[in-house]
């Protein structure tokens, strides 16, 4: 059930990424490390890289508040699972700086893609049942 709650958190992060994609023109255009084709057992490490990236508002007025709120929520850590803790200490996972840097639009698309992949893996590996807590 704890793992389910964690995946529901991933599900929520996808919505926040979608919200930010609506404001991509109001984001600072700086290129950011954007993991792609993440190797097995390094997914949590890659998510940590996405969360650490310096995504920020371009400070262009109207949408600044919602953008900053969304970025803050994206970066908020949820309680770690055992798998997550193990991965963060794996020396074999690439460092954040080693990933190709991409502009905000592609950065957000790759983040969403990884989150969806993790939900897919979780739901595909589960036995029959519900997401109730």
């Amino acid at each position: 059930q704890g793992q389910d709650r964690h995946m529901i958190r991933m599900r929520q992060l996808i919505d926040i990424v979608d919200q930010l994609k609506n404001y991509v023109n109001d984001l600072d255009p700086e290129f950011l490390p954007a993991p792609e084709d993440v190797e097995t057992n390094c997914e949590w490490s890659a998510i940590s890289c996405f969360q650490k990236a310096q995504l920020k508002s371009a400070n262009t007025g109207n949408n600044e508040r919602i953008i900053n709120l969304s970025i803050k929520k994206l970066k908020r850590k949820s309680p770690s699972t055992g798998a997550e803790r193990r991965q963060k200490h794996r020396l074999t996972c690439p460092s954040c700086d080693s990933y190709e840097k991409k502009p905000p639009k592609e950065f957000l698309e790759r983040f969403k893609s990884l989150l969806q992949k993790m939900i897919h893996q979780h739901l595909s590996s589960r036995t029959h049942g519900s997401e109730d807590s």
Epitope: R11, Q19, N22, S70, H120, L123, S133
Partner: antibody
Framework: QVQLVQSGAEVKKPGASVKVSCKAS????????MHWVRQAPGQGLEWMGT????????IYSQNFKGRVTMTRDTSTSTVYMELSSLRSEDTAVYYC?????????WGQGTLVTVSS | DIQLTQSPSSLSASVGDRVTITCRAS??????LNWYQQKPGKAVKLLIY???RLHSGVPSRFSGSGSGTDYTLTISSLQPEDFATYYC?????????FGGGTKVEIK
């Protein structure tokens, strides 16, 4: 068990506002986002937006932006949806729905009638 | 926005029939497709999430399948309590969108 209980039917005049409540029980209120969906008479379902009860972060459908406000009261595990500048086309049943991997539990619905 | 087209919009069937409802998305939604049942005056119920996962308490006669843009809800043997309207909904991209619904009526 999970339960979402909504406030009763409302009749409003055009231009007025309506505030619908949705009281949650049977789970940890702040763990799940709450979505609002409406259904006009004889029509399908239309998504209005969502709120994270842990911090009141909201995402609204462009169709309702500027007219809808979603809030929450953690002390009573209640979410609210307020719709302003009502027009006749807003006559509908309004539903709250908890979102896990899907809208897994729904309120019974609140009929809002907009009529002069 | 992602459009969902449900077909048929209505169908007549008898108890015991096998019923299939389809939902086509305007773009790939990567299995983030859910199915709901609505009866007049009752709360909407989730039947299936993520294409094929049965929600708790839902009878096994309901099943879902599909991928990419095309998805299906099947009721293997229609029961009297299954006469209702069914909606698909995509959870891939905001805004959340629903299909137009399929009303299953008694023949």
């Amino acid at each position: 068990q999970v339960q979402l209980v909504q406030s009763g039917a409302e009749v409003k005049k055009p231009g007025a506002s309506v505030k619908v409540s949705c009281k949650a029980s049977g789970y940890t209120f702040t763990d799940y986002w709450m979505h609002w969906v409406r259904q006009a008479p004889g029509q399908g379902l239309e998504w209005m937006g969502t709120i994270d009860p842990s911090d009141q972060y909201t995402i609204y459908s462009q169709n309702f932006k500027g007219r809808v406000t979603m809030t929450r009261d953690t002390s009573t595990s209640t979410v609210y949806m307020e719709l302003s500048s009502l027009r006749s086309e807003d006559t509908a049943v309004y539903y709250c729905a908890r979102y896990g991997f899907a809208m897994d539990y729904w309120g019974q619905g609140t009929l809002v009638t907009v009529s002069s | 926005d992602i459009q969902l087209t449900q077909s048929p919009s209505s169908l007549s069937a008898s108890v015991g029939d096998r019923v299939t409802i389809t939902c086509r998305a305007s773009q790939d939604i990567s299995n983030f497709l859910n199915w709901y049942q609505q009866k007049p005056g009752k709360a909407v119920k989730l039947l299936i999430y993520y294409t094929s996962r049965l929600h708790s308490g839902v009878p096994s006669r309901f099943s879902g399948s599909g991928s990419g843009t095309d998805y299906t809800l099947t009721i293997s043997s229609l029961q009297p309590e299954d006469f209702a309207t069914y909606y698909c909904q995509q959870g891939h991209t905001l805004p959340r969108t629903f299909g137009g619904g399929t009303k299953v009526e008694i023949k």
